[in-house]
């Protein structure tokens, strides 16, 4: 659950009167531009671990769309346009907060979830296992 | 607000009926497991565009915790181990959901947010501006 | 229909050059990396080079000193430059096309029926 | 460069009979990003070589459920559960984790 505030107006998220259910206003506060993030920077492109980005679409979900990176290559790319597989691409991950609609199809209700998303790729040092 | 997928029991989400304000059950669904992202790998040292992780904690907000990366170069690091200045380390941002407590220490209400956080970073050729 | 067909090969004399093509039909190159693997008469697969969806590229260090891939999209056919060659060049060359770059597989899906390169004097 | 080997390099296996081969790898063949890219391919008499398994253990479309690939790491194995006359030929193991892509020697499934 949600840790709250310790102060005397807020039950302990222990507390069996600690609610499961809260109220959430769907008002969107925006605390920066919402950019469709293909349009907001063509790092994806001009990265030496370059990613292309798929859509996931799930109108069970809000947000219903969600962009997962996935890395093009194996290897990184060098400043020739050749593929160097003595590196890595790999993806970061990051996990983020979603609502799924519970029950299903219903407007008013939500369960809150965590899912794990790809955001980018980076190009990573890798870790040799030789046999023996 | 959230798009209703269109079917007899949901309202339009344009339609004045449609409810600003939903329930959330707050035992949150995990699709995958919860890691610490300082823990989940070590990308973060690994990559040629190494990043620092920076704890944001906020008490009044769900998730309460978000780390934060910051590239620790301007430029990417070489095999070698060196600096190189003619590629720059850049974050790659990610668009998150948030819940923002609404009344202030209230615990059952809260607001929908949307804030941009650095996931990792990752090595880009830059864009050179020459003086004409 | 996917289909790859290699053209190009032929004798060529020690020192020589040769330029191998493979045309593809049914999909893209701009959608599918394509291999170059070779196989000298009687040995296994051996991995040349690869020019991916993206247009990057990656070879086998031995050989990269002396063979180019390329490809032209607009003609929807993937190139091999061989110069230099030796007689342990005699091979069938294969191109072979990778999975869709939405699959991220690496794996080699469908093989032309190869063109046959003999360097000898 | 990553050395794929074989084994065995012959197999005579009777039709309805079933067969294994392993291929070991000189280094592991888990990619940075925790997959494992090793494939098998067979090349027909006559032929040019044809997809059977990606990725371990996932069979390419078109290709029997008699196939099945398996192994982590290093070890790797393809099983044929009952032999038929058509899968005669030359199996090839493969690694594309690491550049320069590399094949196994083969082996060889011939008919009893």
């Known amino acids: 659950g949600i840790a709250i505030p310790r102060n005397s107006g807020c039950p302990n998220s222990e507390d069996k009167n600690f609610p499961r259910t809260v109220m959430v206003n769907l008002n969107i506060h925006n605390r920066n531009t919402s950019t469709n993030p293909k349009r907001s920077s063509d790092y994806y492109n001009r990265s030496t671990s370059p990613w292309n980005l798929h859509r996931n679409e799930d109108p069970e979900r809000y947000p219903s769309v969600i962009w997962e990176a996935k890395c093009r290559h194996l290897g990184c790319v060098k400043a020739d346009g050749n593929v160097d597989y003595h590196m890595n691409s790999v993806p970061i991950q990051q996990e983020i907060l979603v609502l799924r609609r519970e029950p299903r199809h219903c407007p008013n209700s939500f369960r809150l979830e965590k899912i794990l998303v790809s955001v980018g790729c980076t190009c990573v040092t890798p870790i040799v296992h030789h046999v023996a | 607000g959230i798009a209703i997928p269109r079917n007899s029991g949901c309202p339009n989400s344009e339609d004045k009926n449609f409810p600003r304000t939903v329930m959330v059950n707050l035992n949150i669904h995990n699709r995958n497991t919860s890691t610490n992202p300082k823990r989940s790998s070590d990308y973060y040292n690994r990559s040629t565009s190494p990043w620092n992780l920076h704890r944001n904690e906020d008490p009044e907000r769900y998730p309460s915790v978000i780390w934060e990366a910051k590239c620790r170069h301007l430029g990417c690091v070489k095999a070698d181990g060196n600096v190189d200045y003619h590629m720059n380390s850049v974050p790659i941002q990610q668009e998150i959901l948030v819940l923002r407590r609404e009344p202030r220490h209230c615990p059952n209400s809260f607001r929908l947010e949307k804030i941009l956080v650095s996931v990792g970073c990752t090595c880009v050729t830059p864009i050179v501006h020459h003086v004409a | 229909e996917v289909q790859l067909v290699e053209s190009g090969g032929g004798l060529v004399q020690p020192g020589g050059s040769l330029r191998l093509s493979c045309a593809a039909s049914?999909?893209?190159?701009?959608?599918?990396?394509v291999h170059w693997v070779r196989q000298a008469p009687g040995k296994g697969l051996e991995w040349v080079s690869v020019?991916?969806?993206?247009?990057?590229?990656t070879y086998n260090s031995a050989l990269k000193s002396r063979f180019t891939i390329s490809r032209d999209n607009s003609k929807n056919t993937l190139y091999l430059q061989m110069n230099s060659l030796r007689a342990e060049d005699t091979a069938v060359y294969y191109c072979?096309?990778?999975?869709?770059?939405?699959?991220?597989?690496?794996?080699?899906?469908?093989w032309g029926q190869g063109t046959t390169v003999t360097v000898s004097s | 460069d990553i050395v794929m080997t074989q084994s065995p390099l012959s197999l005579p296996v009777t039709p309805g009979e079933p067969a294994s081969i392993s291929c070991r790898s000189s280094?592991?063949?888990?990619?940075?990003?925790?997959?494992?890219?090793f494939h098998w391919y067979l090349q027909k008499p006559g032929q040019s070589p044809q997809l059977l398994i990606y990725?371990?253990?996932n069979r390419f479309s078109g290709v029997p459920d008699r196939f099945s690939g398996s192994g982590s790491g290093t070890d790797f194995t393809l099983k044929i559960s009952r032999v038929e006359a058509e899968d005669v030929g030359v199996y090839y193991c493969?690694?594309?984790?690491?550049?320069?892509?590399?094949f196994g020697q083969g082996t060889k499934l011939e008919i009893k």
């Open positions: 990725k371990v253990s």
């Open positions: 280094q592991s063949l888990v990619h940075s990003n925790g997959d494992t890219y």
């Open positions: 020019i991916w969806s993206d247009g990057t590229t």
């Open positions: 049914g999909f893209s190159l701009d959608s599918y990396g």
């Open positions: 072979a096309r990778d999975t869709h770059y939405r699959l991220y597989y690496y794996a080699m899906d469908y």
């Open positions: 493969s690694q594309t984790t690491h550049a320069p892509f590399t």
